[in-house]
Interface confidence: low
Amino acid sequence: DITPSVPPASYHPKPWLGAQPATVVTPGVNVTLRCRAPQPAWRFGLFKPGEIAPLLFRDVSSELAEFFLEEVTPAQGGIYRCCYRRPDWGPGVWSQPSDVLELLVTEELPRPSLVALPGPVVGPGANVSLRCAGRLRNMSFVLYREGVAAPLQYRHSAQPWADFTLLGARAPGTYSCYYHTPSAPYVLSQRSEVLVISWEGEGPEARPASSAPGMQAPGPPPSDPGAQAPSLSSFRPRGLVLQPLLPQTQDSWDPAPPPSDPGV
């Protein structure tokens, strides 16, 4: 009954699989995986790669089944798919599997890189783009400048990177970036190494972020536009719910909200 035998795609179309509150969470968070079928189903199965039997199943006579993962651990991270079936399909017949959902359970996201495009040396009047590149899509990226406590720019990106444009005349300086999940419960990356942007004729240098004087460590997105980003140590307690960052510089902030979860 639980060995998935997948018929042609047109026969039993695939369901949609989503995660609440997010696909990237810190350990200890309760995660709900929602499997939504395009037609009423009776049994839903949650599968992991290499397993022929469902990790979990739910008997629900509707289009939606919820799988509850309580206080997730990093070991529960990984790739999930869901399928649905009706008993009249015959033994072991499941729908086409959903697209993969990758659940990442981590205390901290990998450190991003920060590079200058076309390069860290700026000619008079020329603009420069700073690319903060992480490894995950649909993240919110934050750019800091040494000596400025509040984030300089903020971008949500569907790509695993975000580009920040600096006007040439104001570009020289020391920069750092980090990224975080776009909604609570927030998971933050380590901060990138600093990047020095200089005028032509002055040599750039890279320094470890920790040695950049006057630059705040990235904080959780403050709810108050005037709030300063606190240091990392002030927001690491597990389970703390953080508030979204509001834009500091309206002209450089991308106000498009993250894609909404169709399962909500």
Partner: antibody, heavy 117, light 106 residues
Framework: DVKLVESGGGLVKPGGSLKLSCAAS????????MSWVRQTPEKRLEWVAT????????YYPDSVKGRFTISRDNAKNTLYLQMSSLKSEDTAMYYC??????????WGQGTTLTVSS | ENVLTQSPAIMSASPGEKVTMTCSVS?????MHWYRQKSFTSPQLWIY???KLASGVPGRFSGSGSGISYSLTISSMEAEDVATYYC?????????FGAGTKLELK
């Protein structure tokens, strides 16, 4: 052998409340959708409530919605039906059933509810 | 709500006679299920998914139909087949039963 044993029926005044229980054995209770079905004195069968295997989802017809609550205790292999604001038309034999797909495949012996003043 | 209408309400048949009872549905469904209830006992699943016989059901019983029209047939009536037969749809909420066909021995 699958066995479903209902209990808790009796005589109740209109507006009163009663809780029915169904003890299940012979199968993995926590893996099955369960339902209550009643049979009126005129021998009509009426679906009353359904609950998903984990208890997260419940379904009712309009005739009992807001008055009846189906629940389950998977640790005790027991299904419940809490009935309140009872009416004379709720008088029936109440059967606990196991869902075997799109239909109840096993039924208990039933317990009788009489609503009368 | 999907209303199931059974006909006839009561019928009688002689031993060996072919018996057919029908169940019509107010809106199309994928599968019909049938229950048998003998006097003073609980209903029993008899035919499921339109045409599949439940465990222990004699081969003289068959089910057929699609859309809004379904039927249960006994190829050769026997005394033990005396009972009330109910059709049931589990395809959509609210789940509904027919009023039953009472089969008697002539």
């Amino acid at each position: 052998d699958v066995k479903l044993v209902e209990s808790g029926g009796g005589l109740v005044k209109p507006g009163g409340s009663l809780k029915l229980s169904c003890a299940a054995s012979g199968f993995t209770f926590s893996s099955y959708v369960m339902s209550w079905v009643r049979q009126t004195p005129e021998k009509r069968l009426e679906w009353v409530a359904t609950i998903s295997s984990g208890g997260s989802y419940t379904y009712y017809p309009d005739s009992v919605k807001g008055r009846f609550t189906i629940s389950r205790d998977n640790a005790k292999n027991t299904l419940y039906l809490q009935m309140s604001s009872l009416k004379s038309e709720d008088t029936a034999m109440y059967y606990c059933t196991r869902e075997g797909g799109n239909s109840p495949d096993y039924w208990g012996q039933g317990t009788t509810l009489t609503v009368s003043s | 709500e999907n209303v199931l209408t059974q006909s006839p309400a009561i019928m009688s048949a002689s031993p060996g006679e072919k018996v057919t009872m029908t169940c019509s549905v107010s809106s199309s469904i994928s599968y019909m299920h049938w229950y048998r209830q003998k006097s003073f006992t609980s209903p029993q699943l008899w035919i499921y998914d339109t045409s599949k016989l439940a465990s222990g059901v004699p081969g003289r019983f068959s089910g057929s139909g699609s859309g809004i029209s379904y039927s249960l047939t006994i190829s050769s009536m026997e005394a033990e087949d005396v009972a009330t037969y109910y059709c049931f749809q589990g395809s959509e909420y609210p789940l509904t039963f027919g009023a039953g066909t009472k089969l008697e021995l002539k």
